[in-house]
């Protein structure tokens, strides 16, 4: 009774289609699978960025897998063939591992790459990225930004750079159709007659870097002798009301400062009849129902009331 063996996949490789970090892992079937042609062979794939402590593990019947990686670091992957126990009348049989690596040969020293890269998706409408030139680079150095997300045929270059002293220090992006809730890949590379420039790679999701506009139309409404309702409207733009959190700052008679975080466009404040002045400002942020992270908006214009009319039912600016 001979021991059942299976070969590892052939030609295991990592392919870079030019999508700035979204890579293809692909392989060919092992040879000598005819003994198992009634049986579906599976593959166990493990991969990670070099330096990461944990492997991502996938079991698949396919001959390829796609995922995003940090191209600032190398990538390592390994794969073996699995014959399920149904194929072997007993325990699962595994081949030896086939291994491969991939990295982009770095040009230039690390200090030449862009510094302090910062990207903000203003009001879920306009993406703007800015950076500082690398340390010690000359004024002839220019940086170029390329981007890709699933849905684009190929990586695109920025067409509207922000410049300072003739150097590109930022990019205003065009309208990005169907670009949220998926990885957005950026590469900023550079050129200089003086020395090679190191490329930098960035990956994020646009909904996580949204900075909304501040709320508008702040109003007061007297609810009772000791309660005032503060109200405002969601900022203009595409962000739905269900996606907002708000932070309020309330000042009574120049002394008391109340801050609160709320999910709705109202806040009820306990007051006394002695209150002579009331001011509040609000800012907004995309909440956890619509993103994993976000940036607070600027504060709204201050809305104040002072004088005896505070006891009346509605106070408008």
């Amino acid at each position: 009774d001979t021991e059942i063996k299976v070969n590892p996949p052939q030609d295991f490789e990592i392919v870079d289609p030019g999508y700035l970090g979204y890579l293809y892992l692909q392989w060919q079937p092992p040879l000598s699978l005819d003994h198992f042609k009634e049986c579906t062979v599976e593959y166990e794939l493990k991969y990670r960025n070099i330096g990461s402590e944990t492997w991502k593990t996938i079991i698949t019947k396919n001959l390829h897998y796609k995922d995003g990686f940090d191209l600032n670091k190398g990538i390592e992957a390994k794969i073996h063939t699995l014959l399920p126990w149904q194929c072997t009348n007993g325990s699962e049989v595994q081949s030896s591992w086939a291994e491969t690596t991939y990295w982009i040969s770095p040009q230039g020293i690390p200090e030449t790459k862009v510094q302090d890269m910062d990207c903000v998706y203003y009001n879920w409408q306009y993406l703007l990225c800015s950076w500082k030139p690398g340390i010690g680079v000359l004024l002839d150095t220019n940086y170029n930004l390329f981007y890709w997300y699933e849905g684009l045929d190929h990586a695109l270059q920025c067409v509207d750079y922000i410049k300072a002293d003739g150097q590109n220090i930022g990019c205003r992006f065009p309208y990005l159709e169907a670009s949220d809730y998926k990885d957005f890949y950026i590469c900023v590379n550079g050129s200089s007659e003086n020395k090679p420039i190191r490329s930098s790679y960035f990956t994020f999701q646009l909904q996580n870097i949204v900075k909304p506009l501040p709320p508008v139309y702040l109003t007061f409404t007297r609810e009772s002798s000791c309660e005032i309702k503060l109200k405002w409207s969601i900022p203009l733009g595409p962000i739905p009301a269900r996606c907002f959190d708000y932070e309020i700052e309330i000042r009574e008679d120049d002394t008391t400062l109340v801050t609160a975080t709320v999910e709705n466009e109202t806040y009820t404040l306990k007051t006394t009849n002695e209150t002579r002045q009331l001011c509040f400002v609000v800012r907004s942020k995309v909440n956890i129902y619509c993103s994993d992270d976000g940036i607070w908006s600027e504060w709204s214009d201050k809305q104040c009331w002072e004088g005896e009319d505070l006891s009346k039912k509605t106070l408008l600016r």
Epitope: D11, E13, V15, P29, S32
Partner: antibody, heavy 118, light 107 residues
Framework: QVQLVQSGAEVVKPGASVKVSCKAS????????MSWVRQAPGQGLEWVGT????????YYPESVKGRFTITRDTSTSTAYMELRSLRSDDTAVYYC???????????WGQGTLVTVSS | DIVMTQSPLSLPVTLGQPASISCKAS??????VAWYQQRPGQSPRALIY???YRYSGVPDRFSGSGSGTDFTLKISRVEAEDVGVFYC?????????FGQGTKLEIK
Amino acid sequence: QVQLVQSGAEVVKPGASVKVSCKASGFTFSSYGMSWVRQAPGQGLEWVGTISGGGSYTYYPESVKGRFTITRDTSTSTAYMELRSLRSDDTAVYYCARRDLRSAMDYWGQGTLVTVSS
Amino acid sequence: DIVMTQSPLSLPVTLGQPASISCKASQNVDINVAWYQQRPGQSPRALIYSASYRYSGVPDRFSGSGSGTDFTLKISRVEAEDVGVFYCQQYNAYPLTFGQGTKLEIK
């Protein structure tokens, strides 16, 4: 539909070099290996090399190893075979073919005649 | 290297009659065998992979069988467009090797 379009015929002198191209369309180029097969006048088929989908692996028979080099350019979906130090017995029609998932060759180009003659 | 030996090298067949081509490998190649047809003046065309599986678009009068070292290509009813040279090929190990070809002609 899958198409492989090869470059035109070449006439070269012994010892010279030539580069034959094969432009692919109708499929995801980087997902498939490409093989090259030659056919001398009136003779059968002879495999002369294979390159994997991503270009990481190349395979050649001993008869051409060191003289023939296969490369690929994903940006233009083109495979190339460079033939160096050519001899008269390298005269043949050179075919590119897509390697299917089993290393058989499922689609073939129209062929490029390379004539080595002094 | 694995040697693939085809027989017969020439096969005259009457239209509508069956035809059979044999291919023997010098060592075990499991089912890693393909068959190709080359019509006069044309590029080869893939017919069969993994010894017995037809490529899409290949008429079902073509069938392949075998494993290990012995393989057969059968044409159930030969048609005029089947004229040409048929090659077997093993891809079990590099270097990939072809049989020397079988020329099918109409009687």
